[in-house]
Structures are given as C-alpha cells and as structure tokens.
C-alpha cells in the first residue's frame, strides 16, 4: 500500500518538475508518508505555497505567470493568511492579488472562484474607490499598515502566487 502511494506521489511530482525542479518537503505528522512539499524557494502556510514575483507586470500577465507555474494570483481567505503573506513583502512595493471586478460594479471575484466575503476583506479605508480600477493590490500605508487598494489592471506591479501544497 505504501509503495503504490509513493509511486502515485512520484508521478505527481514529475508533473511539477518542469517549472519546479526542486521541492522543499516537511513532515506534517508522525507517519512517514505524512509529508507535504512546496517548490523551492516558495514559502508555506497551512495547506498552501506562496511565491512573491518581483517582476513588474500587468494583472493579466501576473496571473498568466502564476498559472504557468501551476498556481494562481493569491486568494486571501483569513486574517492569519494575510499576516503570514505580509511578512515576505516590501513596504515600498505593491502586489497584485487574485481579485478583480470585471464589470466595474463592485462585484469582486477571486480568480479561483472562491466566494467573495465582505467580512473577510482588508481594504484600506476609503477603498475601493474608482469604478474603472478593477484589479486589487495589497500595499502598505503608514496610517493603516497593510491593506488592499483597487488599481487599473494594466499598471505593472509585483505579484503573489499561491498554489496548493504537494502531498
């Protein structure tokens, strides 16, 4: 049983090899098979892996860049997740999130179709504030620390990719 499980895992890892030649794996529990991996040098939090892309690109190119690596622009589900992510961000930069408002009607959507929950949003005060700024970034404001802002999708920014851990 353990052999077939390992074979399955190895074939799954081969899929990732093209873009992630090296993985960092950690033991999740006491059993030898309870390990999880993230591509090196991605960081891990709970069941996901994160990568900060420092190339300046539009939202569409940023999402494309993440998807090529088997990921999406980041979807933030909890305050704890955001607190983890910001540890790796630079205060003088802005980073695209996987959040957009395609219709310009303030109907925000996450790239992975996770329902947008108003109660778990971290907009800076007064944001979002422009109907033609339909993509979201996370940035630092001295008055409010880290929060979200709406921005034109075609303005190049850094970005954050997120993918499920490899088990």
């Amino acid at each position: 049983f353990m052999y077939s499980k390992t074979v399955k895992r190895l074939s799954k890892l081969r899929e990732y090899q093209q873009y992630h030649p090296s993985l960092t794996c950690v033991m999740e529990g006491k059993d030898i098979e309870d390990w999880s991996c993230c591509p090196t040098p991605w960081t891990s939090f709970q069941s996901s892996c994160y990568f900060i892309s420092t190339g300046m690109q539009s939202w569409t190119k940023s999402q494309k860049n993440c998807s090529v690596m088997g990921a999406d622009l980041v979807v933030i589900n909890t305050r704890e997740e955001q607190d983890f992510i910001i540890q790796n961000l630079k205060r003088n930069s802005s980073y695209f999130l996987g959040l957009s408002d395609p219709g310009g009607r303030r109907h925000w959507q996450w790239v992975d179709q996770t329902p947008y929950n108003e109660n778990v949003t971290f907009w800076h005060s007064g944001e979002p504030n422009n109907l033609d700024e339909r993509c979201a970034i996370i940035n630092f404001r001295s008055s409010e620390e880290w929060g979200w802002n709406d921005i034109h999708c075609h303005v190049p920014q850094k970005s954050i990719c997120k993918m499920k851990k490899i088990y």
Epitope: K61, N130, D132, V155
Partner: antibody, heavy 123, light 111 residues
Framework: QVQLVESGGGLVKPGGSLRLSCAAS????????MSWVRQAPGKGLEWVSY????????YYADSVKGRFTISRDNAKNSLYLQMNSLRAEDTAVYYC????????????????WGQGTLVTVSS | DIVMTQSPDSLAVSLGERATINCKSS??????????MNWYQQKPGQPPKLLIY???TLESGVPSRFSGSGSGTDFTLTISSLQAEDVATYYC?????????FGGGTKVEIK
C-alpha cells in the same frame, strides 16, 4: 454628445511652463479615466499621462516624468496638464482623450479625442 | 515597454480594392482569448478616431468595410473596399500593460 475641447497651447521658450486645459461635456466626466496624448509635427502618437476617474492615481511616460503634472477637477468637468521645464522635443499637438474599458476592465481604448492644442517650444 | 511595429509605412491602393495593414507587438497582448489591440484612423488636421478595439470589435458607427483580426503578437486591419474618405494614417495601439504604446502609423493613399 461627447465633447472634449483643449486650450492653453502656444509658443514658449525652452525651460518655460504652460498649463493645458481640457473641457469635457456630454458624459459623466467623473466616471472616466482621462489621458493626454501628443503628436509631434509629422510624427506618430505618443501617450503622455493619464489620471484615474477620482484623480487619486496618476501615471506618466518616462519622457515627461518629473516635469509634467496631470490633474482634474470633476466639479468643473476639466482635465489639466501642467508642463514645466519644457524642451524643444515637447513641441507637439496635445490631445486629451477618454478611456473606455472593455474585457472586464482589463484593457481600454481611447474612444473620444479633442481637436488638440499646439504647444511650440522654441527660443 | 511593449513595442508596436506597423507595416508597411505607406500603402497606395486603388478605389474599391482591399487594403491590409499589419501590426506586430514585441510581447503577447492577449489574456484568456481576448486582445488589448486597438486601431485608430487619423485624417489630416483631425484627431485620431477609434475604429476597432479588442482586436476585432468594430466601434459604433464605423463602416463594416473595416475589420480587425489577429491574436498574440500579430494583428491586421483590413479595409475590404477602399473608399476616397478612407485616405488617412492608421495606428495600432496596445493597452495590455502600461505605458500604452502606438505603432508608427501606416499612411493609406489612393493609387
């Protein structure tokens, strides 16, 4: 109907300043991102700057960064371009243009343009 | 910056004949099957006028003899049957990523 009317162009010496205005009518000005685009005599089109609908975000071409400032007054339906430290290569017809977004706001086209105002920088 | 290269620089076409203008971008300007490619017409002494957006969508009021096609990095503007009033310079533009950039223009004349 949508109308954009530029004014403020003229002859100015190198190093001088000029302020262009664009008066908008026929649409809800405060809902649109606006651009300045220029065209040197006999040459092609070059984007200069744009400003978000609320005025909070501004963007500039590298060639004018630090010298030009875009602003708007939504109460007056007006767009402005303050041009300082002017150079001979800034000589052009300056157009204001409205952004119209498509494909879910990812992209835009400049769907309405003014007639333009000529700026000549010469000693 | 994304560089837009138009060809030819100028084009002489007989009335009623087809005119084809090409535009090549230095990087793809597509996402999810949509293109951020626009085409403008500029007649002498006039401002540019939007003809086509999203590579192939005709702006309201533009005659159907104008059409746009292409994806990725290669795009084409076609005038199926040239009319006298089509004498102008035509520009392509991408708005995928700032700064928005224009092609150098193609001047269309009557042969």
């Amino acid at each position: 109907q949508v109308q954009l009317v530029e004014s403020g162009g003229g002859l100015v010496k190198p190093g001088g300043s000029l302020r262009l205005s664009c008066a908008a009518s026929g649409f809800t000005f405060s809902s649109y991102t606006m651009s300045w685009v220029r065209q040197a005599p006999g040459k092609g089109l070059e984007w200069v700057s744009y400003i978000s609908s609320g005025g909070g975000n501004t963007y500039y071409a590298d060639s004018v960064k630090g010298r030009f400032t875009i602003s708007r007054d939504n109460a007056k339906n007006s767009l402005y371009l303050q041009m300082n430290s002017l150079r001979a290569e800034d000589t052009a017809v300056y157009y204001c243009a409205r952004h119209d977004y498509y494909d879910g706001g990812l992209y835009y086209a400049m769907d309405y343009w003014g007639q333009g105002t000529l700026v000549t920088v010469s000693s | 910056d994304i560089v837009m290269t138009q060809s030819p620089d100028s084009l002489a076409v007989s009335l009623g004949e087809r005119a084809t203008i090409n535009c090549k971008s230095s990087q793809s300007v597509d996402y999810d099957g949509d293109s951020s490619m626009n085409w403008y017409q500029q007649k002498p002494g006039q401002p540019p006028k939007l003809l086509i957006y999203a590579a192939s969508t005709l702006e309201s009021g533009v005659p159907s003899r104008f059409s746009g096609s292409g994806s990725g990095t290669d795009f084409t503007l076609t005038i199926s049957s040239l009319q006298a009033e089509d004498v102008a310079t035509y520009y392509c533009q991408q708005t995928n990523e700032d700064p928005p950039t224009f092609g150098g223009g193609t001047k269309v004349e009557i042969k």
